[in-house]
């Protein structure tokens, strides 16, 4: 069977993507300029390193983490890079328009690139739920809608709830998870006969997914501390994230063994559970006052992640059509909620300790913030899902789900690559 890219997409994708890129270039030309102030070069290098860590997380970490499908590993990695590159460009412009535009020009700094990379990361988390069932043209739509929704959510939360960069960005876990799950819910669900093998994992792609997990594991402290404004807060965030992810690795591997009748370790469980602590500790990483608390949180997160990986895929596969190995969506949704609950608990403790009263009001505000993030994620996810179902995108036929050969040129076209 010929595996050429469908003719219609061959017309649609380059035109759509290159027109969009040309539009972005024009927007950058008219509305942006670099920060021209003299800065301490050492500080500049240190600032760049944080951005570099985030890019490594996005391109290598999330890129490879989603590459465990037997027949869809190339697409997972490369499509991730494509989305990251596009998402960062749009996020820089959007953040600038939302926060700086009254002054007429968007000033681009290393910090704005850092923010944009984190916004683009949201898409890479969400897309795990739909990779293999959509083409690049559809992914472009998903990037634009999700980055726009997240940017607006952050601005609204900042203005209504008076929160800083870190707090309004840490809703990314919950936002990305629910966005991805609601998009997946809109897409055709049942896997047609004869494609069941394609959404299974294979040894070499699973190894590359583990490599992705390792990169994420190493750089998660950078992600959680990137938007904190003082050295002491960053130090706390780095330490607490490190303790949490360290414990979640131990919990993931031992918990995975415990969950298997023969005591065997599941690759899929481990891929995502090693990151559990980092997600759960994200919102409050700078606030947790002692290592043991971060470690307990890592333990709980690891157990939730393994438990979720064991019992939720069946449900997700039936209801949302998400394959068993794409567990980032429901994993992040649970762990993101755990992180938000921990933050609310810490807020209550602070209010009680300071003797300032109004505990109920503070809790209500935090729940309002979280609810807003979930509602906007679900609404914008459903909107995206509906858009992706439009015929104009020439979505892959269901028989071509999870198949690199639909998108890539393989000179040999060897059977069972």
């Amino acid at each position: 069977m010929s595996s050429k890219y469908p003719r219609s997409v061959r017309r649609c994708l380059p035109l759509w993507a290159l027109t969009l890129e040309a539009a972005l270039i024009l927007l950058f030309y008219f509305f942006t300029h670099y920060d021209a102030s003299l800065e301490d070069q050492k500080g500049l290098v240190a600032s760049y390193q944080v951005g570099q860590d985030l890019t490594v997380m996005a391109a290598i970490g999330l890129g490879f983490l989603t590459s465990s499908f037997r027949r869809h590993s190339w697409s997972s990695v490369a499509f991730n890079l494509f989305m990251l590159a596009l998402g960062v460009q749009w996020a820089i412009l959007l953040d600038g328009f939302l926060s700086q535009f009254p002054s007429g020009k968007v000033v681009i700094t290393l910090f704005s690139i850092r923010l944009a990379t984190m916004s683009a990361l949201s898409v890479l988390i969400s897309v795990d739920a739909v990779l293999g069932k959509v083409n690049l043209a559809q992914l472009v739509v998903m990037v634009l809608v999700e980055v726009t929704a997240l940017g607006n959510l952050r601005m609204v939360i900042s203005n209504i709830f008076n929160t800083d960069y870190h707090m309004n960005m840490m809703h990314i876990y919950v936002f990305a998870a629910y966005f991805g799950l609601s998009v997946a819910w809109c897409l055709p669900k049942p896997l047609p006969e004869g494609t069941e093998d394609k959404d299974q994992t294979a040894t070499i792609p699973s190894l590359s997914a583990m490599l992705g997990a390792l990169f994420l594991w190493m750089f998660w402290p950078s992600f959680n501390s990137a938007l904190l404004r003082s050295p002491i807060e960053r130090k706390n965030a780095v330490f607490n994230t490190y303790y949490a992810v360290a414990v979640s690795v131990v919990t993931a591997i031992s918990g995975s063994s415990l969950a298997h009748p023969q005591g065997k370790i599941s690759k899929t469980y481990v891929h995502s559970a090693v990151l559990a602590g980092g997600v759960a500790v994200g919102t409050s990483c700078h606030l947790i006052p002692s290592p043991w608390l971060a470690m307990v949180l890592g333990l709980v997160a690891g157990l939730i992640s393994v438990g979720g990986a064991k019992y939720l895929p069946g449900c997700c596969n039936r209801v949302l059509g998400i394959p068993h190995s794409s567990i980032m969506g429901y994993n992040f949704s649970l762990l993101g909620l755990l992180g938000e609950i921990i933050y609310i608990v810490l807020l209550v403790l602070d209010t009680v300790g300071a003797g300032n009263g109004m505990i109920g009001f503070q809790v209500l505000l935090s729940i309002g913030e979280l609810s807003l993030a979930i509602v906007i994620a679900l609404m914008s996810g459903l909107l995206t899902g509906l858009l992706l179902n439009l015929k104009i995108w020439k979505a892959p036929h269901e028989a071509k789900y999870f198949d690199d050969q639909v998108f890539w040129k393989f000179p040999h076209l060897a059977v069972g690559f």
């Epitope: 920060d35 944080v50 700094t109 910090f111 709830f161 960069y165 300790g353 300071a354």
Partner: antibody, heavy 125, light 107 residues
Framework: EVQLLESGGGVVQPGRSLRLSCAAS????????MHWVRQAPGKGLEWVAV????????EYADSVKGRFTISRDNSKNTLYLQMNSLRAEDTAVYYC??????????????????WGQGTLVTVSS | AELTQSPGTLSLSPGERATLSCRAS???????LAWYQQKPGQAPRLLIY???SRATGIPDRFSGSGSGTDFTLTISRLEPEDFAVYYC?????????FGQGTKVEIK
């Protein structure tokens, strides 16, 4: 002893530029966020801009966005405020202030614990 | 969040109790509210941070309280050196904002 010393103020015509400096001593400058705050004659305090400890991020009041640029040189322990397209309403005493972060019960508190003595900028034709 | 201080001017005698109010247009974390004192020709001086914690070297006659949108600075017994202008200030998301100030003057 912590000291912040502003300089660079003076009389300038509308539309022209001026650059303020704030020399810091007595503390590790590179670990603190730094702010500019101004006070028009007979008026209250108005926050102008902040730069994070590592210079990675800068934030501005809407009234100065696009005209003022805050920067720092951690190797020289100096904070700067480049003021372009000055207007009459920019006439004020400009203070630099150090932002300290301290832990409360759980949350972190922020405060301007040290201020410079101020430098007067007069924008007049 | 905009901060509104009241009253604009407070005329009291030494030894009296002064209560200064600061109201925010939206809820702010008490960790992010501070009070400053400014005397003519001088730079502001930090009095209270985190809504209720006294800064180093500040006498215990100064106390702060409140949460949400309503905050209060109390001077239990006014001393002659306490007659000055007092500002509340908040930070949550940018921008940082100051109240318009309350002038405490001798009656």
């Amino acid at each position: 002893e912590v000291q912040l010393l502003e300089s660079g103020g003076g009389v300038v015509q509308p539309g022209r530029s001026l650059r303020l400096s704030c020399a810091a001593s007595g503390f590790t400058f590179s670990t603190y966020g730094m702010h500019w705050v101004r006070q028009a004659p007979g008026k209250g305090l108005e926050w102008v801009a902040v730069i994070w400890f590592d210079g990675s991020n800068k934030e501005y009041a809407d009234s100065v966005k696009g005209r003022f640029t805050i920067s720092r040189d951690n190797s020289k322990n100096t904070l700067y405020l480049q003021m372009n397209s000055l207007r009459a309403e920019d006439t004020a005493v400009y203070y630099c202030a150090r932002e300290e972060v301290v832990r409360g019960v759980i949350l972190w508190s922020r405060k301007f614990d040290y201020w410079g003595q101020g430098t007067l900028v007069t924008v007049s034709s | 969040a905009e901060l509104t201080q009241s009253p604009g001017t407070l005329s009291l005698s030494p030894g009296e109790r002064a209560t200064l109010s600061c109201r925010a247009s939206q809820s702010i974390s008490s960790s992010y509210l501070a009070w400053y004192q400014q005397k003519p020709g001088q730079a502001p001086r930090l009095l209270i941070y985190g809504a209720s914690s006294r800064a180093t070297g500040i006498p215990d006659r100064f106390s702060g309280s409140g949460s949400g949108t309503d905050f209060t600075l109390t001077i239990s017994r006014l001393e002659p050196e306490d007659f000055a202008v007092y500002y509340c200030q908040q930070y949550g998301s940018s921008p940082w904002t100051f109240g318009q100030g309350t002038k405490v003057e001798i009656k």
